[in-house]
Amino acid sequence: RQQWELQGDRRCQSQLERANLRPCEQHLMQKIQRDEDSYGRDPYSPSQDPYSPSQDPDRRDPYSPSPYDRRGAGSSQHQERCCNELNEFENNQRCMCEALQQIMENQSDRLQGRQQEQQFKRELRNLPQQCGLRAPQRCDLEVESGGRDRY
């Protein structure tokens, strides 16, 4: 790869390391859960709670009043925070794509089934526009099999 390309990647990496993308993840998960609920899924099925503390306590947004709010009261709050974070990537389309890829990777092991994964991916692609930002033209959101390491 070109040297200047790597330099740009480093600056992007610096932003990615500093970004708190959890509100984006929470906003999207709540959105697809609500969509599923409206099709008759039991809204209180514990296995569907992607932020149940027993599953992953350290991924909770510390500013969130509750681990998960299916009714969406906190969702607009999550969306606002999410948009504030994504706004940092507005002028760098490649870096915006990497931020979206990171969100996809972080959530990939919580998405149940191909349908939910596709739905999450669709919502994720629309996220920049929802925030009034430019969406990256080409952005591969496929997650490599094997997922990611968690520590």
């Epitope: 480093r10 600056r11 990496q13 610096s14 390391e17 002028n91 760098n92 870096c95 990611r148 520590y151």
Partner: antibody, heavy 98, light 109 residues
Framework: VKVSCKAS????????INWVRQATGQGLEWVGW????????GYAQKFQGRVTMTRDTSMSTAYMELNNLTSEDTAVYYC????????WGQGTRVTVSS | TQSPDSLAVSLGERATINCKSS????????????LGWYQQNPGQPPKLLIY???NRESGVPDRFSGSGSGTDFTLTIDSLQAEDVAIYYC?????????FGQGTKLEIK
């Protein structure tokens, strides 16, 4: 010499690893960086050709190997997490004697 | 290049350390200056104080502040405390190599 740096308490792939060295009574000298997710690396010109940075993601461990050592390489070698080096290891002392 | 090499300031007074980069560390696409300030005490690893030239790292007292853009930067310590005696380094991470300044030794007058 191969110096290791074991990460804990965070997602290893998410943050770059920097390597910095410091000779006794001297300033900080940046050696290079590695992205654990992609394996991409970048080295200071001074170390090109004799330094190699690798990682074992399954062990959350980064490695820095420095070859053809001279007494001038005697220093404490630090690994640091993140592009802007937010968290530092305690350092590994490397002594090269003739 | 950092200046001065060493500095003696009275307790409660202000300390100012300068850092000049040979090339601009400002990135227009992110609107950020990729420069950090570190504090190092004897026998300890460095500690990040300021990132992106002016953002205080979490847990760092608010008497520490960073300013500047492009090639000229300043670390200011308001109301110097005894525990601030240390060596301070700037580092640019805009482009490889991520060079450090030579360090400024801060002492109590």
């Amino acid at each position: 010499v191969k110096v290791s740096c074991k990460a804990s308490g965070y997602t290893f792939n998410r943050y770059d690893i920097n390597w910095v060295r410091q000779a006794t009574g001297q300033g900080l000298e940046w050696v290079g960086w590695m992205n654990p997710k992609t394996g991409n690396t970048g080295y200071a010109q001074k170390f090109q050709g004799r330094v190699t940075m690798t990682r074992d993601t399954s062990m959350s461990t980064a490695y820095m190997e420095l070859n053809n050592l001279t007494s001038e390489d005697t220093a404490v070698y630090y690994c640091a997490r993140g592009v802007d080096a937010t968290h530092w290891g305690q350092g590994t002392r490397v002594t090269v004697s003739s | 290049t950092q200046s001065p090499d060493s500095l003696a300031v009275s307790l409660g007074e202000r300390a100012t350390i300068n850092c000049k980069s040979s090339q601009s560390v400002f990135d227009s696409s992110s609107n950020k200056n990729y420069l950090g300030w570190y504090q190092q005490n004897p026998g300890q690893p460095p500690k990040l104080l300021i990132y992106w030239a002016s953002n205080r790292e979490s847990g760092v007292p608010d008497r520490f502040s960073g300013s500047g853009s492009g090639t000229d930067f300043t670390l200011t310590i308001d109301s110097l405390q005894a525990e601030d005696v240390a060596i301070y380094y700037c580092q640019q991470y805009h482009s490889t190599p991520h060079t450090f300044g030579q360090g400024t030794k801060l002492e109590i007058k």
